[in-house]
């Protein structure tokens, strides 16, 4: 006899993972057999996905891998024309096991910012997070916070937070580790000991110390008046994250120094700075005959001519001397590009140590001038083609510059080193190279080791001393 | 009352061919779903194929697949196993099962008395 | 493809002996778990089916129980034509596997 349906088995809930088999099962006993659909989400199933299988004509409906997607509410019909059709419903819930979708990642940051260390997970359930500092379990206390999202947040970061993190989801199917991720904590550069102010006599020599801070370990630079501190000589040491820095100085006049020690962040640096005043006890002005004062090299033209910590004469009858003597030599060198290779390295030294002369310190700091016979050496023998347009130049009045006048020296006016030997500085450059005459050797003392070759006569010569200038 | 009966089973060379077949009676034949299930010397059982009495869904083991055809002949109330390139791991007692729809899932609620195949050189 | 571990691979026992055989899944199938027994020459015979209901014909002595993951045949007194093979087999995937057997002795 005819029989309408009737669903013998209705749909349960069916819990399964992604990739798992899920089968619903819809028995129903009918005569004749029933025609049995399927629709999730109230749309029809398509049967001939091959995602799905078919049994025992439409009663069990198996999904063979299940994907997240296939989350859903299922139900069966079955019809047989005989009353109405039936239906039953089940749900699937695809379960997951943890997942950490988005990881934490390594995190420098500034001490006293908030840091997030992010940690999105997956899962069914929804996963609970946690976080592990180093070995063991971290616990939130009044600045750090495990956030909904699953990330960990740290307010006014400080120094100990720094370290080695992961985050862990958890979920009643399983667990899952993030890898291992560092936090950096970074102290803007703070200095621990400033520089102390001296007031010490002239010549004499002063250390002064700056001690600073910071992560990463700040650099120290010093800087005197505004510069960068080219003389002196700096000792540093680094412990325990704080840099120790020395700077000795030989005093030739006042100075304010500063220590500045700064680190980075990214592309920005945190900087500190301490300055020490330097004075030299009795040291108003120059007194009216002194002229100048000694002072230890700091340009950059005559730096390879000049010997290392060189003291020179910066004359005071300009406002800013080394200013002034500086762009007298720059001015002048850049003409000296021209001349031959015998001449230029000469020629160099002459104007540099002719514009910057050696210094004798003391009550009143003289100037020492060039020894004549190396002005001559110079003129006569190294550049004397040069040395004689350059003269006609001036003759005929084309160079309207005092300055260019000012950086060659009037050889005759220059004390003989025969006269008095210390009265007079030598040229080191000029010393001559008996295995190779055009090599000038880099200066090491202001002592020449050899004899000056013997110079052609010139009717213009204006010394009457021998025509070999004995320089020994 | 149920009956089947497979026949077709003997001794054949690795590489070769072999097509078994399992007469069914006592059942509404058509309207079952049949299997064949093995069983090697001394071993497990091991599903290898089902299909569903039109046809329509053919189901067998990840292992066999390419090598072994099931087949139905609903007028002849006959089951048919094709095999071919047949390897000595073949060798096993197969049985011809119907599958029933039970309170929950199938299961073979009926067997043959099984056919030996043997696969050797 | 689910598979389905049985423990122990082989037992011995005494007839009137409780007897405990379990099968686990590799995946939840909820209750869709048959147990055969199978006597040497024999054809396999179904038991027990959709976990824990027992087969026509079977005696009572026979249950199953279990969901999910894990299922239990139980022989609450063994009887001396209860000493077989036992094979359980999931049916929840198209794709059927059974359980390797357990081997029931007498001891």
């Known amino acids: 006899l005819p029989k309408a349906p009737v669903i013998t088995t209705p749909l349960e809930t069916v819990d399964a993972l992604v990739e798992e088999v899920a089968t619903f099962m819809c028995a129903v006993e009918s005569y004749p057999q029933p025609e049995i659909s399927w629709t999730r989400n109230k749309i029809l199933i398509k049967l001939f996905d091959t995602r799905y299988s078919i049994r025992e004509n439409g009663q069990l409906l198996t999904i063979l891998s299940v994907e997240d997607s296939d989350d859903g509410i299922y139900c069966c019909t079955a019809n047989n024309g005989v009353g109405g059709a039936v239906e039953s419903c089940g749900a699937l819930q695809v379960k997951m096991k943890p997942k950490i979708t988005r990881p934490p990642i390594n995190v420098k940051i500034i001490e006293g910012l908030k840091a997030v260390l992010p940690c999105t997970t997956m899962g069914n359930p929804k996963p609970s997070v946690s976080w592990i500092k180093g070995d063991s379990p971290l616990r939130e206390n009044s600045r750090t916070a495990v956030l909904e999202s699953g990330s960990l947040r740290i307010h006014n970061v400080q120094k100990e937070d720094a370290g080695q993190y992961r985050c862990v989801a958890k979920n009643s199917l399983g667990t899952a580790y993030s890898k291992v991720v560092k936090l950096e904590v970074e102290v803007f550069a703070r200095i621990l000991r400033a520089p102390e102010s001296h007031n010490v006599t002239f010549g004499s020599f002063v250390t002064l110390h700056c001690t600073a801070t910071g992560i990463p370990v700040p650099t120290i630079t010093w800087i005197e008046n505004g510069n960068a501190v080219s003389s002196g000589s700096i000792q540093e040491s680094v412990k325990d994250r704080v840099i120790d820095s020395r700077l000795q100085l030989f005093i030739t006049k006042p100075g304010l120094y500063t220590c500045i020690a700064t680190n980075k962040h990214g592309e920005k640096f945190s900087t500190a700075k301490a300055a020490a005043t330097v004075s030299i006890a009795e040291w108003s002005k120059p007194q009216k005959d002194n002229k100048g004062y000694c002072a230890q090299y700091r340009g950059e033209v005559c730096n390879a001519v000049l010997a290392k910590d060189a003291l020179v004469f910066l004359n005071t009858s300009y406002a800013d001397p080394e200013e002034a003597q500086e762009l007298l030599v720059h001015t002048a060198w850049n003409e000296l590009k021209v001349v031959s290779p015998l001449c230029r390295p000469a020629a160099e030294a002459l104007l540099c140590n002719h514009v910057f002369q050696e210094c004798s310190p003391g009550v009143v700091p003289t100037p020492i001038p060039i020894c004549r016979e190396y002005c001559l050496a110079v003129k006569e023998l190294f550049c004397a083609k040069e040395w004689l347009a350059m003269e006609e130049k001036t003759h005929r009045g084309l160079y309207r510059s005092e300055m260019h006048l000012l950086s060659v020296p009037e050889c005759s006016k220059l004390p003989s080193m025969h006269w008095d030997p210390t009265a007079c500085a030598r040229l080191p450059h000029l010393d001559y190279n008996k295995e190779n005459p055009k090599t000038f050797p880099p200066m090491t003392s202001s002592k020449p080791s050899v004899d000056i070759p013997n110079l052609p006569s010139s009717s213009s010569s204006s010394f009457s001393v021998s025509p070999t200038y004995s320089m020994t | 009352e149920v009956q089947l009966v497979e026949s077709g089973g003997g001794l054949v060379k690795p590489g070769g061919s072999l097509r078994l077949s399992c007469a069914a009676s006592?059942?509404?034949?058509?309207?079952?779903?049949m299997a064949w299930v093995r069983q090697a010397p001394g071993k497990g059982l091991e599903w290898v194929s089902s299909v569903s009495g039109d046809s329509h869904h053919i189901y067998y083991a990840d292992s066999l697949k390419g090598r072994f055809t099931i087949s139905r002949d609903n007028a002849k109330n006959s089951l048919y196993l094709q095999m071919n390139s047949l390897r000595a791991e073949d060798t096993a007692v197969y049985y011809c099962?119907?599958?029933?729809?039970?309170?929950?899932?199938?299961?073979?609620?009926?067997w043959g008395q099984g056919t030996l195949v043997t696969v050797s050189s | 493809d689910i598979q389905m571990t049985q423990s122990p691979s082989s037992l011995s026992a005494s007839v009137g002996d409780r007897v405990t055989i379990t099968c686990r899944a590799s995946?939840?199938?909820?209750?869709?778990v048959n147990w055969y027994q199978q006597k040497p020459g024999k054809a396999p015979k179904l038991l027990i089916y959709?976990?824990?209901t027992l087969q026509s014909g079977v005696p009572s002595r026979f249950s199953g129980s279990g969901s999910g993951t894990d299922f239990t045949l139980t022989i609450s007194s063994l009887q001396p034509e209860d000493f077989a093979t036992y094979y359980c087999?999931?049916?929840?995937?198209?794709?059927?596997?059974f359980g390797q057997g357990t081997k029931l002795e007498i001891k």
């Open positions: 006592g059942f509404t034949f058509s309207a079952s779903t």
């Open positions: 087999q999931q049916s929840y995937s198209p794709l059927y596997t």
């Open positions: 995946q939840r199938i909820s209750g869709f």
């Open positions: 959709a976990a824990s």
């Open positions: 099962a119907r599958e029933r729809l039970l309170r929950l899932g199938v299961g073979f609620d009926s």
